[in-house]
C-alpha cells in the first residue's frame, strides 16, 4: 500500500510541478520593472522569455514578441532551452509514469517492468526539475547582474543636464512559479525512485516462496522461477504461490482475469 501511495503521490506532485514549469515558461512576468526607486512612472514594464510587455496607467497593455533569434542574448536562449528540455522530459516522464502506476493494469505487464518504468520516469522528473530550477536561476542571476549594473549607471551618469531614467528590472512572479514548480517536479521524481524500490521484485522473497510451495500439492509451471531473474510473467507466478511471504502491498496488486486498463 505504501508503495502505491508513494508512487501515486510522486506522480501527482510531478504533474503539478510540470504544469507549473509550463505555466512559468509561458508567463510574461519573468522580470518586472523595479518601482522601489522610481514609483512615479505612468507605465509598468515587464518581460518574459518570449515577449516584453508595457502596461500603461490608462490600463492598456501592449506586448511585443521577440521576433528574432540571432539578436537575443545567449543567456535568454539558454534559459529557453533549459525550460523546454524540462517540459519535454517532464511530459515524457508523465507518459511513462502513467503506464508504470500500480493502480493501472496494462495487459499482463510485470511488476519488474513497472519498476523500471517508475525509475525511468522518476529520473526524468528529477532532470526536468533540475532543468527548470537551473533555467530560472540563470535568469535570476542575469537580472541581479543587470540590476546592479544599471544601479551603478544611475549614480555615475548624473553629470549631464538631461537625465535618462534607467529602467531596472527585478524578479517577476514567473521566477517563483518556476522555482516552486521545479522543486515539486524534483520531489515527485525522488518519490517515484523511492516507489521503484518497493515495486522491484526481491529475489529472496521468491526463493522462500518456492520452498514453501514444494510442500504443497500444487502443480507449478516451470516458468515460476523466472521471477528471480527479473523477467518472465511474475504476476502469474505470484498467483500460483498464494501462501508465500508477500507484503500486504503485493497481495493487493494481484490481477484477476477481469482486470483491464
Amino acid at each position: 500500500m505504501a508503495v502505491t501511495a508513494c508512487q501515486g503521490l510522486g506522480f501527482v506532485v510531478s504533474l503539478i510541478g510540470i504544469a507549473g514549469i509550463i505555466a512559468a515558461t509561458c508567463m510574461d512576468q519573468w522580470s518586472t520593472q523595479d518601482l522601489y526607486n522610481n514609483p512615479v512612472t505612468a507605465v509598468f514594464n515587464y518581460q518574459g522569455l518570449w515577449r516584453s510587455c508595457v502596461r500603461e496607467s490608462s490600463g492598456f497593455t501592449e506586448c511585443r514578441g521577440y521576433f528574432t533569434l540571432l539578436g537575443l542574448p545567449a543567456m535568454l536562449q539558454a534559459v529557453r532551452a533549459l525550460m523546454i528540455v524540462g517540459i519535454v522530459l517532464g511530459a515524457i516522464g508523465l507518459l511513462v509514469s502513467i503506464f508504470a502506476l500500480k493502480c493501472i493494469r496494462i495487459g499482463s505487464m510485470e511488476d519488474s517492468a513497472k519498476a523500471n518504468m517508475t525509475l525511468t520516469s522518476g529520473i526524468m522528473f528529477i532532470v526536468s526539475g533540475l532543468c527548470a530550477i537551473a533555467g530560472v536561476s540563470v535568469f535570476a542571476n542575469m537580472l541581479v547582474t543587470n540590476f546592479w549594473m544599471s544601479t551603478a549607471n544611475m549614480y555615475t551618469g548624473m553629470g549631464g543636464m538631461v537625465q535618462t531614467v534607467q529602467t531596472r528590472y527585478t524578479f517577476g512572479a514567473a521566477l517563483f512559479v518556476g522555482w516552486v514548480a521545479g522543486g515539486l517536479t524534483l520531489i515527485g521524481g525522488v518519490m517515484m525512485c523511492i516507489a521503484c524500490r518497493g515495486l522491484a521484485p526481491e529475489e529472496t522473497n521468491y526463493k522462500a516462496v518456492s520452498y514453501h510451495a514444494s510442500g504443497h500439492s500444487v502443480a507449478y509451471k516451470p516458468g515460476g522461477f523466472k521471477a528471480s531473474t527479473g523477467f518472465g510473467s511474475n504476476t502469474k507466478n505470484k498467483k500460483t504461490y498464494d501462501g508465500g511471504a508477500h507484503t500486504e502491498d503485493e497481495l493487493q496488486s494481484y490481477p484477476s482475469k477481469h482486470d483491464y486498463v
Epitope: V40, T41, A42, V54, E56, S58, F60
Partner: antibody, heavy 118, light 113 residues
Framework: EVQLQESGPELVKPGASVKMSCKAS????????IHWVKQKPGQGLEWIGY????????KYNEKFKGRATLTSDKSSSTAYMEFSSLTSEDSAVYYC???????????WGQGTSVTVSS | DIVMTQSPSSLSVSAGEKVTMSCKSS????????????LAWYQQKPGQPPKLLIY???TRESGVPDRFTGSGSGTDFALTISSVQAEDLAVYYC?????????FGSGTKLDIK
C-alpha cells in the same frame, strides 16, 4: 458619442470648499481613468491627479495632496473633485479628462469655472 | 518633476505657411520597454478645453487633419503644421505622459497674420 459633462460655475469664499462633478457618457465608465487638470486664467495647464473608477483608487500631484479629494460613483458614471481651504490662487477652470492609449487625454469636459472671492 | 520647455512662446504666420514648434523635456520620455515616447500635443482654442492632436510623440489622434505631424524622441520633440489654416489659431501644449506628476509645457501661441 463620448462626453464628459462638468458641473456649473462656482463662486466661493476663501477658506471654503467646493465639490465639482464630471458625468461620463458614451463609454464604459470603469474602463477609463479620469484625470483632473487646472488652468488659471490666461495661464497653462496643471495636472491635479486622477481617479480610477474601477478601483476607486486616486493618485495626486504632491502639490495638491491634502486639499484635493478625488472620488467616483460607478452607479451614476460620475467622477468628483472636492477642493478644500480655497484661496484666490485656486480661482481657475478645472477640467476633467479621460485617459486613453499612450497615456494621453483624448476627451475633455467643458470645464468648471471656480472663482474664489470674498 | 519633469520640466517641459516650449519654444517659441508665440509665433505669427500667414495662412498656408509651414510652422514648427519645439518642446524639450528635462528627462527622456522614451520608455525602454516598448521604445515608445510618451509625449502628447494638445491644441486649445480660445474659450475651449484642450483637444488631443498627437500622442506617443508621433501618432495622430483620429479625426486630426494630416497637416499636423509630431516628431522627435527622448528629450527633443516638435509639432509641425505643414500648411497653417485660419482655424489653427490656438495655444499648443506638449505634455509628459511618462512620469507623475504629468506636466505640461507653458504653451506656444499661434497667431494668423
Amino acid at each position: 458619442e463620448v462626453q464628459l459633462q462638468e458641473s456649473g460655475p462656482e463662486l466661493v469664499k476663501p477658506g471654503a470648499s467646493v465639490k465639482m462633478s464630471c458625468k461620463a457618457s458614451g463609454y464604459t465608465f470603469t474602463n477609463y481613468i479620469i484625470h483632473w487638470v487646472k488652468q488659471k486664467p490666461g495661464q497653462g495647464l496643471e495636472w491635479i491627479g486622477y481617479i480610477n473608477p474601477y478601483t476607486d483608487g486616486p493618485k495626486y500631484n504632491e502639490k495638491f495632496k491634502g486639499r484635493a479629494t478625488l472620488t467616483s460613483d460607478k452607479s451614476s458614471s460620475t467622477a468628483y473633485m472636492e477642493f478644500s481651504s480655497l484661496t484666490s490662487e485656486d480661482s481657475a477652470v478645472y477640467y476633467c479628462a479621460r485617459l486613453n492609449r499612450g497615456n494621453a487625454m483624448d476627451y475633455w469636459g467643458q470645464g468648471t469655472s471656480v472663482t474664489v472671492s470674498s | 518633476d519633469i520640466v517641459m520647455t516650449q519654444s517659441p512662446s508665440s509665433l505669427s504666420v500667414s495662412a498656408g505657411e509651414k510652422v514648427t514648434m519645439s518642446c524639450k523635456s528635462s528627462q527622456s520620455l522614451l520608455n525602454n520597454g516598448n521604445q515608445k515616447n510618451y509625449l502628447a500635443w494638445y491644441q486649445q482654442k480660445p474659450g475651449q478645453p484642450p483637444k488631443l492632436l498627437i500622442y506617443g510623440a508621433s501618432t495622430r489622434e483620429s479625426g486630426v487633419p494630416d497637416r499636423f505631424t509630431g516628431s522627435g524622441s527622448g528629450t527633443d520633440f516638435a509639432l509641425t503644421i505643414s500648411s497653417v489654416q485660419a482655424e489653427d489659431l490656438a495655444v499648443y501644449y506638449c505634455q509628459n505622459d511618462l512620469y507623475y506628476p504629468f506636466t505640461f509645457g507653458s504653451g506656444t501661441k499661434l497667431d494668423i497674420k
